[in-house]
């Protein structure tokens, strides 16, 4: 399916609005520090050029690849060396090395100020004054902070953002209408970004075989009535889409995603009974809906797997003939029977089955060797079941904030070398698993919890890769994608860690504490808790609880005082001294 001009092809397929949005996202994800106006200028230039190619595909440069065109455009930025340092060296390379170089310089934790939400009236005025610029600014600000955000999905978020302002800026109580919608978009956006980051890490660090295995398991759970061939086709197409988006090929990715949605809607009968309501929606909403669609009901009478995967005399023959196909079918058959298992557990089971066949098919009596293979699965299944049970009990007992604190202590003891902001961010997010998953029925708890934890732990891995400080983190992150969570769960107190020297400055607080939001106060307290554990890794739960209770009381007292700053100055050192004594 070759075209004389790739840029013209994509412009025609996507339409001007989506084309411009995706190019803006691509540029913002590559050059994360560039000002908005600079990106808008570049996007307009690319769009004008694309239009000339639509008019005449033989026009000069229209035959160039998108990477060449976009890379050339990015390399025209005047301040590249000053702003990005060594990233400017990418411009000396030829494609495809230049694009790979840009990808390697994407920053998962860019030094950008947190987005401050203006007053509702200010936002509504900006929306009405120039809707197009307002929405472009949204795409730019999200994309530069989330350089792996799934681009076609970001267009969907932007459409919802637009709809929220269009509706709420007309409302009697603008704030009551708008703010909950913006909160929801922010939270969903962060979750979407983190999920996509795991997909990209899976592809980039472990290869497309790892991603395909994940996709077979997940799609087989979603579409248990679909044939293996159908699931395989969807997996192949989905892998192409995500490979493109993770590789910065956002126009191709969005185009292929639209094709996949079209295919699924044209073939609902052989995929799932749950697709109907998605398929009536417009493109962006349709693709989102299909990605989030609930699992179809399992067929009524699925037989046990023993006959084909243990009892058959042809197991080793079938395995040897086409290993990945045979393992893929095993994973498909297992996953469609177990929507109650996490994808990561299903992948561990497939890995265990593969290891058994590798060993047994070379043995004197293969059948005798692998006859009990399914019995070996039981501990693998029970480990996450028990983990979810124990942690949900702890969450129900403590509530979210104290559950997060328990995880902060647990993870700081495991990997105390990791920076305090990273430990706070990751542990707070790990703690959100309780509210997200523990209220669900038994059959949905494990897939919710373990697959969510995989996403959060990937964030730890991504941040740690940028600044490696712990061999244990590196080991858990790089050895096996599917065993990351069990690897972290198994870590104990780091006995080799030399406790951090006490620094009174770390535990000095001021009156500004009193004006913080509840969330910001929690983060301050949790930052102090991590620092305490780094100072005294062997402190008991009771000791830490005592110090934290005293901290809360001290802050509450000073925030009620007439002269707050004087109170913090006087009571702060007392709190520090009492804490040191309590932890001695």
């Amino acid at each position: 399916d070759t075209h004389k001009s790739e840029v013209a092809h994509r412009f025609k397929d996507l339409g001007e609005e989506h084309f411009k949005g995706l190019v803006l996202v691509a540029f913002s994800q590559y050059l994360q520090q560039c000002p908005f106006e600079e990106h808008v200028k570049l996007v307009n230039e690319v769009t004008e050029f694309a239009k000339t190619c639509v008019a005449d595909e033989s026009a000069e440069n229209c035959d160039k690849s998108l990477h060449t065109l976009f890379g050339d455009k990015l390399c025209t930025v005047a301040t590249l060396r000053e702003t990005y340092g060594e990233m400017a060296d990418c411009c000396a390379k030829q494609e495809p090395e230049r694009n790979e170089c840009f990808l390697q310089h994407k920053d998962d934790n860019p030094n950008l100020p947190p987005l401050v939400r203006p007053e509702v009236d200010v936002m509504c005025t900006a929306f009405h004054d120039n809707e197009a610029t307002f929405l472009k600014k949204y795409l730019y600000e999200v994309a530069r902070r989330h350089p792996y955000f799934y681009a076609p999905e970001l267009l969907f978020f932007a459409a919802r953002y637009k709809a929220a302002f269009a509706e709420c800026c007309q409302a009697a109580d603008k704030a009551a209408c708008l703010l909950p919608k913006l909160d929801e978009l922010r939270d969903e956006g962060k979750a979407s970004s983190a999920k996509q980051r795991l997909k990209c890490a899976s592809l980039q660090k472990f290869g497309d075989r790892a991603f395909k295995a994940w996709a077979v398991a997940r799609l087989s759970q979603k579409f248990p009535k679909a044939e293996f061939a159908e699931v395989s086709k969807l997996v192949t197409d989905l892998t192409k889409v995500h490979t493109e988006c993770c590789h910065g090929d956002l126009l191709e990715c969005a185009d292929d995603r639209a094709d996949l949605a079209k295919y699924m809607c044209e073939n609902q009968d052989s995929i799932s009974s749950k697709l109907k309501e998605c398929c009536d929606k417009p493109l962006l909403e349709k693709s989102h809906c299909l990605a989030e669609v609930e699992n179809d009901e399992m067929p009524a009478d699925l037989p046990s797997l023993a006959a084909d995967y243990v009892e058959s005399k042809d197991v080793c023959k079938n395995y040897a003939e086409a290993k990945d196909v045979f393992l893929g079918m095993f994973l498909y058959e297992y996953a469609r029977r177990h929507p109650d298992y996490s994808v990561m557990l299903l992948l561990r089971l497939a890995k265990a089955y593969e290891a058994t066949l590798e060993k047994c098919c070379a043995a004197a009596d293969p059948h005798e060797c692998y006859a009990k293979v399914f019995d070996e699965f039981q501990p693998l299944v029970e480990e996450p079941q028990n983990l979810v049970k124990q942690n949900c009990e702890l969450f129900e007992q403590l509530g979210e904030y104290k559950f997060q604190n328990a995880l902060l202590v647990r993870y700081t003891k495991k990997v105390p070398q990791v920076s305090t902001p990273t430990l706070v961010e990751v542990s707070r997010n790990l703690g959100k698993v309780g509210a997200k998953c523990c209220k669900l029925p038994e059959a949905k708890r494990m897939p919710c919890a373990e697959d969510y934890l995989s996403v959060v732990l990937n964030r730890l891995c991504v941040l740690h890769e940028k600044t490696p400080v712990s061999e244990k983190v590196t080991k858990c992150c790089t050895e096996s994608l599917v065993n990351r969570r069990p690897c972290f769960s198994a870590l104990e107190l780091d006995e080799a860690y030399v406790p951090k020297a006490f620094n009174a400055e770390t535990f000095t607080f001021h009156a500004d504490m009193c004006t913080l939001s509840e969330k910001e106060k929690q983060v301050k307290k949790q930052t102090a808790l991590v620092e305490l554990v780094k100072h005294k890794p062997k402190a008991t739960k009771e000791q830490l609880k005592g110090v934290m209770d005293n901290f809360a009381a001290f802050v509450e007292k000073c925030c009620k005082a007439d002269d707050k700053e004087a109170c913090f100055a006087e009571e702060g050192p007392k709190f520090v001294a009492a804490s040191q004594a309590a932890l001695a």
Epitope: E297, M298, S304, L305, D340, F374, Q378
Partner: nanobody, 115 residues
Framework: QVQLQESGGGLVQPGGSLRLSCVAS????????MGWYRQAPGKQRELVAS???????HYADTVKGRFTISKDNAANMVYLQMNALEPEDTAVYYC?????????WGQGTQVTVSS
């Protein structure tokens, strides 16, 4: 060794009700399917009702609206509530529990619907 034991069968008049129970003893983990099948004299064994791990239920057309299948995961038990019984429901009813490693059957319990 896994064993299934059905109970609750018996003789009942047309229009009456029975509740069948089935309990699994022994270690069975990873159950994905629990079902009730029946076999009338001289006929093939047929699926009456099944319930899967995701809570989906499936009923034979002849029993829809009259029979209800339910389960207790913690106790590895499956039930069949049978209302508005008809003479055609007379059969031996078998309980079936499946995990990926095997398909486990009970010995059956006789249900007779007769006036």
């Amino acid at each position: 060794q896994v064993q299934l034991q059905e109970s609750g069968g018996g003789l009942v008049q047309p229009g009456g009700s029975l509740r069948l129970s089935c309990v699994a003893s022994g270690s069975i983990w990873g159950i994905y399917h629990m079902g009730w099948y029946r076999q009338a004299p001289g006929k093939q064994r047929e699926l009456v009702a099944s319930i899967t791990v995701d809570g989906s239920t499936h009923y034979a057309d002849t029993v829809k609206g009259r029979f209800t299948i339910s389960k207790d995961n913690a106790a590895n038990m499956v039930y069949l509530q049978m209302n508005a019984l008809e003479p055609e429901d007379t059969a031996v009813y078998y309980c079936d529990i499946r995990n990926v490693g095997g398909d486990y059957w009970g010995q059956g319990t006789q249900v007779t619907v007769s006036s």
